[in-house]
Amino acid sequence: HNTTVFQGVAGQSLQVSCPYDSMKHWGRRKAWCRQLGEKGPCQRVVSTHNLWLLSFLRRWNGSTAITDDTLGGTLTITLRNLQPHDAGLYQCQSLHGSEADTLRKVLVEVLADPLDHRDAGDLWFPGESESFEDAHVEHSISRSLLEGEIPFPPTS
């Protein structure tokens, strides 16, 4: 599996999408896990509803949500209030029995919030008709890792 990079801004939300063959993975619950080290296990963060038919319902674990469009074949993970410690390698998984097939490997990168270093005078505020939520855009920039790029720092 190639690794896809998703970049988000600290303090904001990041949406990660994992496309899959909806027939190949029909009836299977999905999960989002965090890779512990280059060859370590993938620790489950959140999984879709226990009843596959209700996979479209958003499930949360802390600041991470998961929802599955089982007809369209897209698993969506939302990382709310992104923090530097959220950066790392993750996997979208398809579950069957106690087995898990990898749908996509994801490298989450957290960018510093550019607003953190500005004077209050430079801050942009929403107008009367705009809510603060409207201005709180979800950033989701993705790319595939280039050949030779390593998602983990090399270990000695």
Partner: antibody, heavy 123, light 107 residues
Amino acid sequence: EVQLVQSGAEVKKPGESLKISCKGSGYSFTSYWIAWVRQMPGKGLEWMGIIYPGDSDTRYSPSFQGQVTISADKSISTAYLQWSSLKASDTAMYFCARQRTFYYDSSDYFDYWGQGTLVTVSS
Amino acid sequence: DIQMTQSPSSVSASVGDRVTITCRASQGISSWLAWYQQKPGKAPKLLIYAASTLQNGVPSRFSGSGSGTDFTLTISSLQPEDFATYFCQQADSFPRTFGQGTKLEIK
């Protein structure tokens, strides 16, 4: 009506190659995994491996990895099991089976089976 | 690999009898277990999946129970067509594995 129809019985000599087939009908062949299961004379069932004809994703049992090749041709709704060099110990009945995922528990079981292909390897 | 052990290996019974076959997994498999019936010269037929769910078209005299490592298949009142060999199969992990089979014979 869902059907899996397997090719006929084969008698081969050790060292010969062989490819047996399993043709699916009555359902979307590319949307279900197909497994191969061996049953040696008077013995139990052994899972050999599985293929998803939609993209030819294949998994093998460690016991059969490197011993057989599982493939599929989705254009003719057919899965195959092949040997490059048969041994006498390959003598058995071989079944193909459709694997269905039951959403109740997100796991998969074999809901339709072919009639079996008897392979006899003898010098 | 997960080992599946069935007992007894064979059982003799009469029409109308209640028969129980057990299957034990070498490690916990939750409820990821199926039961199949096979008659001589025929392909196996799915009876029960997810340990206790009856496959469509299977008579209600067949029932399954258990979770973890211990499972049972019960036929409440044997019919002549039930004399066959029964296999359990785990669907927990690869490679999928079957029990060695239980042959149900007419007494």
